[in-house]
Interface confidence: medium
């Protein structure tokens, strides 16, 4: 807390202008007024104020806006940003892109601090979904923002927001997230030809399932085996030595490097071993010829 | 990146007027009070006007008061330097410079003389 | 406006510590904490080097360092290099205006 003192004769600060760097906190304190700092905030940015001095300011904000900053002082906090606590942020109404891009730039180059998340999930609740634009923006920003969201949250992306997503906005998700993204992937890109298709889609694939899987073994798209790798164990396995083989096309190959790495290696299991030796990759560990074939699934399922 | 171009200076005779003009880019000038400077050959440097970023206030060094005029054009990122009855002690390199206090982006300079 | 008061020369053998004094008045060094250093090479414009008395802008190496006592400012360049010979000017605001030292050369020996 500053204590309250009376502002030296000539101090009184007329305008938010750089002389305010010379000023003690107690100065600060006592020769700004918070209604004319809230007008001029813009300007606080193009001046270099110390940390403790921009804890004055921000105090004399609170003060101000004890139930939060109105927009109009939020688009320009600028590095006053940096003090704010996620407490003080849950406080605020922010509705404009802008208000949010002006934020994240300040943090911009560092990792998604608390009080930028809070900041993300207040506009996001305030707008009901996560639009294409709020996702454009964030994406710009954070690209890894997208699998930092709950399946939950997921859900409430509409699928034409998938257009904004690039595939290194998904490197960090996990194969729940993909599953709720898949599908939205689908439906945004379904009217696309083959080739764009798959170019469009492959990111999503880890939450592909095995009928989808099979139908793009039918279109030559050649996968590649970074995004094999990525698919769920679950949709692989039911695949075929020839859906496995088309799907691939002349990836095919890298199957031998990671035979002992799932999917690929669960996948080898389920597979007859005269089928993989068609594929003359050495590869081994299929069941052996002669043996039966029992669908453990099915027979549950029945019983 | 960030920069400030004098220009206008050169060879005035005493009594005669020059206009000096300094543009700035790479930052939000109109955000940024802004300052000459000006350093006489061989000697050291001199303040001589600073203005505001609104433009709402002016100082002058007493050497230069009712004969200098500072202003600036926002939407045009420049500042100004119109110099009346200009004498032989104002020869001298002028810079300008940003801010109003301290100045930490400096033009090159732009010589002015005055002589007969 | 009344310059502020800087020796004409110092100087300095390679890593040793200068300092350089600026003496005002009650009105202008004294007043405030709005005193700032600068660094200027023959022949090019000058370079902000400490501004509010101590402060450094990035950039500017931590070899350069600044302090005040009553209507004195002082600059200490310490592990002097090569690079530093240059004239060095303090400045400070004065009621509504800026006064400039007469400039310091740093010689280095």
């Known amino acids: 807390e500053v204590e309250k003192t009376a502002c030296p004769s000539g101090k009184k600060a007329r305008e938010i202008d750089e002389s305010l760097i010379f000023y003690k906190k107690w100065e600060l304190e006592a020769c700004v007024d918070a209604a004319l700092l809230a007008t001029q905030m813009d300007r606080v940015n193009a001046i270099p104020f110390t940390y403790e001095q921009l804890d004055v300011l921000k105090h004399k904000l609170d003060e101000l806006y004890p139930q939060g900053y109105p927009e109009s002082v939020i688009q320009h906090l600028g590095y006053l940003f940096l003090k704010m606590s996620p407490e003080d942020i849950r406080k605020w109404n922010v509705t404009s892109l802008e208000t949010l891009k002006a934020l994240l730039e300040v943090n911009k180059g560092h990792e998604m601090s608390p009080q930028v998340a809070t900041l993300i999930d207040r506009f996001v609740k305030g707008r009901g979904q996560l639009d294409k634009d709020t996702l454009d923006t964030l994406t710009a920003f954070y690209p890894g923002y997208l699998c930092s969201l709950s399946p939950e949250e997921l859900s409430s992306v509409p699928p034409s927001s998938i257009w904004a997503v690039r595939p290194q906005d998904l490197d960090t998700c996990d194969p729940r997230q993909l599953d709720v993204l898949y599908p939205k992937a689908r439906l945004a890109f379904q009217n696309m030809n083959g080739s764009e298709y798959f170019v469009k889609i492959q990111s999503f694939l880890g939450g592909a399932p095995t009928e989808d899987l099979k139908a793009l073994s039918q279109q030559n798209v050649s996968m590649d085996l970074a995004t094999f790798m990525k698919l769920r164990t679950d949709a692989v396995l039911p695949l075929t030595v020839a859906e496995v083989q088309k799907l691939l096309g002349p990836h095919v190959e890298g199957l031998k490097a990671e035979e002992r790495h799932r999917p690929v290696r669960d996948w080898i299991l389920r597979q007859r071993q005269d089928d993989l030796d068609t594929l003359g990759l050495g590869l081994q560990g299929g069941i052996p010829n002669g043996y039966l074939v029992l669908d453990l699934s099915m027979q549950e399922a029945l019983s | 990146q960030v920069q400030l171009v004098e220009s206008g200076g050169g060879l005035v005779q005493p009594g005669g007027s020059l206009r000096l003009s300094c543009a700035a880019s790479?930052?939000?000038?109109?955000?940024?009070?802004m300052s000459w400077v000006r350093q006489a050959p061989g000697k050291g440097l001199e303040w001589v006007s600073g203005i505001s970023y609104s433009s709402s206030a002016t100082y002058y060094a007493d050497s230069v008061k009712g004969r200098f005029t500072i202003s600036r054009d926002n939407s045009k990122n420049t500042l100004y330097l119109q110099m009346n009855s200009l004498r032989a002690e104002d020869t001298a390199v002028y810079y300008c410079?940003?801010?109003?206090?301290?100045?930490?982006?400096w033009g090159q300079g732009t010589l002015v003389t005055v002589s007969s | 406006d009344i310059a502020l008061t800087q020796p004409a020369s110092v100087s300095g053998a390679p890593g040793q510590r200068v300092t350089i004094s600026c003496t005002g008045t009650?009105?202008?060094?004294?007043?405030?904490?709005?005193v700032t250093w600068y660094q200027q090479h023959p022949g090019k414009a000058p370079k902000l080097m400490i501004y509010a008395v101590n402060k450094r802008p990035s950039g500017v190496s931590n070899r350069f360092s600044g302090s005040k006592s009553g209507n004195t400012a002082s600059l200490t360049i310490s592990g002097l290099q090569a690079e530093d010979e240059a004239d060095y000017y303090c400045a400070s605001r004065d009621s509504s205006s800026m006064v400039f030292g007469g400039g310091t050369k740093l010689t280095v020996l």
């Open positions: 790479g930052f939000t000038f109109s955000s940024y009070g």
């Open positions: 410079a940003r801010y109003l206090y301290y100045f930490d982006v």
């Open positions: 009650s009105s202008d060094v004294g007043a405030s904490d709005t």
